[in-house]
């Protein structure tokens, strides 16, 4: 299926979005930085197909939502400018779920990426545990919100790879 | 493990209004949509519609728009149902039921209902 | 819109026989969006299959579900006493996100 092109406006104004809710230099948070191991070759379109690497995308995007519409969340962040996000993630999850309906039909669903879901889900459990341990802290949202970028970023360049296989 | 609490049992005349609410603790995600849905006596189920909390996004089903407004607080998460121009055919216990967030994948998780209220029975009477 | 028709309407056993519980759908369902429930008087609904045939947490494994397209089965292989109530299947659509119950088919001791 093809995603609507709003598809990847609302993922770069999402990535813009959690750039401006930055609130402290990442060079004050140097002491609380973490490598989270995200699992770049799981999420990567080069290694996956278009109808796997949807449900792949979609829990990215789930647990991303989940962890920024967490009650701590709404007291470190802009209201603003986190509705907005929040609001982008979810017409994100929208069309990523209206592409699988169409896509899958009655065929089996891509569970081949079983592995890649759990990487996943595994990666973003790191992160809650962390901002757990540190008290949901400034610096700790901080270095989150960071790290969410990065896993954005990613997979806005699993879309664009995937726009140009068609 | 996420459990919802619906509120009591009501009686209400034709045309009025009622409000169901439903009070949801455990591993709770405001991310994840509550829906509610209905089953008159002696009947099957029947989906009415659901919200996001997190954001306040609700879905209709199409027999129920004009007449059903679902409202949610995100603190403590709570789901609010209101059925308004009450016929006595709205007589029928009314369920909140969430998704699972266990399941994977996400997507696959939010189509079914894993947690269900106990029922809050409406009775439309004169 | 979606219909989902379940048959029989009542199926009367004994405890110790098979029972398979049909679910026909009007128009192609993904088996992974085709969910079963079971029903005891009184009782909330109770998820038991999902997917299409992962069973939920607790289910026992005498249940299971199969099917693909616009026809599915919940099969419980051996009926203990506890079995006996209303099974439904549900479907879901999106977008807009739809969730679509059948009838129920009640599970009677015969």
């Known amino acids: 299926c093809d995603l609507p092109q709003t598809h990847n406006l609302r993922n770069k104004r999402a990535l813009t979005l959690l750039v401006q809710m930055r609130r402290l230099s990442p060079l004050s948070c140097l002491k609380d930085r973490k490598d989270f191991g995200f699992p770049q070759e799981k999420v990567d379109a080069q290694q996956i197909k278009k109808a796997q690497a949807i449900p792949v995308l979609s829990e990215l995007t789930q647990q991303i939502l989940n962890i920024f519409t967490s009650k701590d969340s709404s007291a470190a962040w802009n209201t603003t400018l986190l509705d907005s996000f929040c609001n982008d993630l979810h017409q994100q999850l929208n069309d990523l779920q209206g592409c699988l309906m169409q896509q899958v039909g009655v065929q089996e669903f891509p569970l081949t990426q079983e592995d890649a879901l759990l990487a996943v889900r595994k990666y973003f459990h790191r992160i809650t545990v962390y901002l757990r341990e540190k008290k949901h802290s400034p610096c700790a949202w901080e270095v989150v919100r960071a790290e969410v970028w990065r896993a954005l970023s990613s997979s806005a360049n699993v879309l664009g790879r995937l726009r140009e296989e068609k | 493990e996420v459990q919802l609490l619906e509120s009591g049992a009501e009686v209400k005349r034709p045309g009025s209004s009622v409000r169901v609410s439903c009070r949801a603790s455990?591993?709770?995600?405001?991310?994840?949509?509550i829906s509610w849905v209905r089953q008159a006596p002696g009947q099957g189920l029947e989906w009415m519609g659901r919200?996001?909390?997190?954001?306040?996004?609700?879905n209709y089903a199409q027999n129920f728009r004009g007449r059903i407004t679902i409202t949610a607080d995100k603190s403590p998460l709570t789901a609010y149902l209101e059925l308004s121009s009450l016929r006595f055919e709205d007589t029928a216990v009314y369920y909140c039921?969430?998704?699972?967030?266990?399941?994977?994948?996400?997507?696959?998780?939010?189509?079914?209902?894993?947690?269900w209220g106990q029922g809050s029975l409406v009775t439309v009477s004169s | 819109e979606i219909v989902l028709t379940q048959s029989p309407g009542t199926l009367s056993l004994s405890p110790g026989e098979g029972a398979t519980l049909s679910c026909r759908a009007s128009?192609?369902?993904?088996?992974?969006?085709l969910t079963w429930y079971q029903q005891k008087p009184g009782q909330s609904p109770r998820l038991l299959i999902y997917?299409?045939?992962s069973r939920a947490t607790g289910v026992p494994d005498r249940f299971s579900g199969g099917g693909s397209g616009t026809d599915f089965t919940l099969t419980i292989s051996r009926l203990e006493p506890e079995d006996f109530a209303v099974f439904y299947c549900q479907s879901y659509h999106s977008p807009p996100p739809v969730y679509t119950f059948g009838q129920g088919t009640k599970v009677e001791i015969k």
């Open positions: 919200i996001l909390p997190a954001l306040g996004v609700t």
């Open positions: 128009q192609n369902v993904s088996r992974h969006y």
């Open positions: 997917g299409g045939s």
């Open positions: 039921a969430s998704p699972s967030a266990d399941i994977i994948p996400s997507i696959l998780g939010t189509t079914l209902f894993a947690f």
């Open positions: 455990g591993d709770t995600f405001s991310s994840y949509p």
